[in-house]
């Protein structure tokens, strides 16, 4: 997974929204204790911004040491800074914790760019604005890192919420959420509402701002509008899903749907951008360029290098298209679509040199590791990671940024055939899965 602008085929699969509506499966499940309703103590427990990650306050050790921890659905280790680092305000001091237990084992996590390494142990962990429980969890105490911590991000560690298969050093290291569910009565589900500000935040504003909510063990109805639509988790490693169709302003990209998921498609709160496989990225940019051709943007804008600016308050949102991703539904031959606005994929950036203008960075980028639905996508939606039922739910977020003419949307059902063929089967090798 990546926090900055980080971290073989079949043809013609229809997937057209034929206007044909399938009989509606009840996507609202019957009430279950602990799974539904209000989670007031957890609402607004995230801070941060899409460019540098969203973090939750956690405590580790006895007496408790408070740290801000990046919420990352694209990895599976709970890892915290445990030694001085120029970008850290504070770090976990194991020697001060009476409940720390050393596992006498090291861990090394390389990324394509950068790495972190540390020492494994366990300690007592709780989330002050989360469920009222304390769990003994595995902790990687980071002693050395490169291109991992971000200057000014205000977080000191990472909470990997994905599955054990991608945990380091191997899948025997139980991830935090597994420990939480095993040791408590917290249901095996969490949900995320990431709230993009829609305008740039300076450091003091970020510290004061609300970034969203991580609801542990349930779903809070106040955080979304409309219905929740669910897509199956294809395989429990990353939160892998299957995209069956992509549209730009309603125009199908008309690619073999395997391309959209080459070599996988994941939902990753630890990545800033919507990242697309090379061929898909090129087709999407071509289509977005064509739709917004009333203005000529520099090549560097599409690369994420150049900002584009407009006089304050005059951003021409209407010239930019909406982007729809169709996801495999829970019912055979049924899909649904999630639609994001330019308010999600143009990321506001503050630059003193151009402070009189509203400036933006293009937050869709190329990937060599498949589609990554990062904060750009997640900021439009309330996303339910229903691990118990092996599915991910999407509903329109109550905090998404939009204008008077268009809003993000989650709509369905649509008839889509042969969706299973859209998944790419990664050849099994011994290669690291985390080398993203």
């Amino acid at each position: 997974t990546q926090h900055g602008i980080r971290l073989p085929l079949r043809s013609g699969l229809g997937g057209a929204p034929l206007g044909l509506r399938l009989p509606r499966e009840t996507d609202e499940e019957p009430e279950e204790p602990g799974r539904r309703g209000s989670f007031v103590e957890m609402v607004d427990n995230l801070r941060g911004k899409s460019g540098q990650g969203y973090y939750v306050e956690m405590t580790v050790g006895s007496p408790p040491q408070t740290l801000n921890i990046l919420v990352d659905t694209g990895s599976s280790n709970f890892a915290v800074g445990a030694a001085p680092h120029p970008f850290l305000h504070r770090y976990y001091q194991r020697q001060l914790s009476s409940t720390y237990r050393d596992l006498r084992k090291g861990v090394y996590v390389p990324y394509t760019q950068g790495k972190w390494e540390g020492e494994l142990g366990t300690d007592l962990v709780s989330i002050p604005h989360g469920p009222n429980v304390t769990v003994r969890a595995n902790i990687a105490a980071i002693t050395e890192s490169d291109k991992f911590f971000i200057n000014g991000s205000n977080w000191e560690g990472i909470l990997g919420l994905a599955y054990a298969e991608i945990a380091r050093p191997d899948d025997s290291l139980e991830p935090f959420f597994d420990s939480l569910v095993k040791q408590t009565h917290v249901p095996n589900l969490f949900s995320l509402q990431l709230c993009g500000a829609g305008f740039p935040l300076n450091q003091s504003e970020v510290l004061a701002s609300v970034g969203g909510s991580m609801i542990i063990g349930g779903i809070d109805h106040s955080l979304y509008t409309g219905s929740l639509w669910y897509t199956p988790i294809r395989r429990e490693w990353y939160y892998e899903v299957i995209i069956v169709r992509v549209e730009i302003n309603g125009q199908d990209l008309k690619m073999d749907c395997k391309e959209y998921n080459y070599d996988k498609s994941i939902v990753d709160s630890g990545t800033t951008n919507l990242r697309l496989p090379k061929k898909v990225f090129e087709a999407a940019v071509k289509s977005i360029k064509a739709a917004s051709s009333t203005e000529k943007f520099p090549d560097g804008f599409w690369l994420g290098e150049q900002l584009v600016c407009w006089q304050a308050g005059t951003t021409p949102w209407n010239i930019f298209p909406v982007i729809s991703l169709y996801l495999m539904g829970e019912v055979t031959n049924q899909s649904f679509r999630i639609t994001i606005l330019p308010q999600q994929y143009l990321r506001p950036v503050e630059d003193v040199a151009t402070s009189q203008d509203d400036c933006y960075k293009f937050a869709i980028s190329q990937s060599s590791t498949g589609t990554v639905m990062g904060a750009v996508i997640m900021e439009g939606f309330y996303v339910v990671f229903d691990r118990a039922r092996k599915r991910i739910g999407f509903a329109v977020s109550a905090c998404h940024v939009h204008d008077e003419f268009r809003t993000a949307a989650v709509e369905g059902p649509f008839v889509t055939l042969d969706m299973e063929d859209c998944g790419y089967n990664i050849p099994q090798t011994d290669e690291s899965t985390l080398m993203t």
Epitope: I5, K147, N151, F297, D299, L307, D351, C359
Partner: antibody, heavy 116, light 107 residues
């Protein structure tokens, strides 16, 4: 306040190499590409290339391929440019400049003099 | 590569005058042009981006205009500190290219 502090002047022999540095402060280093620009005495400006500190992605001017190598060290928020096989044609002031809209921030420049 | 041509290497003007420095691109660059001012021995100072937007802190006597291939930097009420060199730059496509520069001199 955004600042780009470049290393001091260099007097180097033909055929050798030199590594220039540009230390950034006042912004999140990973968020912006860093560019390098050449200016020969009394002449115009030439764009050498740029690097994305978040993932080391590089875009070079073909003219400087094999001459300039761009790198970064994110832990010290520093960009580097190494120039190899130096000749008198490489005698110039070299600037680092940060992305934004065009190039809104420039370092003070490093004078490289290639002389036997 | 896109060629940026500043046809006048030197321009004569007087303090208080209005002067226009021109720049021509060899192909359409939209409005993706910047202007820089350079005092001898110093680094370029950004003045204008997106053809006509002033960077923060740039005096309003500097005005940029143009789109496509023809661009102009106009300095009204020229001050003595403006008698330096001005460069245009296109950032529409890679490699980024600069004009050869225009030096303002006293008449």
């Amino acid at each position: 306040e955004v600042q780009l502090q470049q290393s001091g002047a260099e007097l180097v022999r033909p055929g050798t190499s030199v590594k220039l540095s540009c230390k950034a402060s006042g912004y999140t280093f990973n968020n912006y590409w860093m560019h390098w620009v050449k200016q020969r005495p009394g002449q115009g400006l030439e764009w050498i290339g740029m690097i994305d500190p978040s993932d080391d992605d590089i875009k070079n001017n073909q003219k400087f391929k094999g001459k300039a190598t761009l790198t970064v060290d994110t832990s010290s928020s520093t960009a580097y440019m190494q120039l190899i096989s130096l000749t008198s044609e490489d005698s110039a002031v070299y600037y680092c400049a940060r992305s934004g809209v065009a190039l809104p921030y420039w370092g003070q420049g490093t004078l490289v003099t290639v002389s036997a | 590569d896109i060629l940026m041509t500043q046809s006048q290497k030197f321009m004569s003007t007087s303090v208080g005058d209005r002067v226009s420095v021109t720049c021509k691109a060899s192909q359409n660059v939209g409005r993706n042009v910047a202007w820089y001012q350079q005092i001898s021995g110093q680094s370029p100072k950004p003045l204008i981006y997106s053809a006509s937007h002033r960077y923060s802190g740039v005096p309003d006597r500097f005005t940029g205009s143009g789109s496509g291939t023809d661009f102009t930097l106009t300095i009204s009420n020229v001050q003595s500190e403006d008698l330096v060199e001005f460069f245009c730059q296109q950032y529409n496509s890679y490699p980024y290219t600069f004009g050869g520069g225009t030096k303002l001199e006293i008449k």
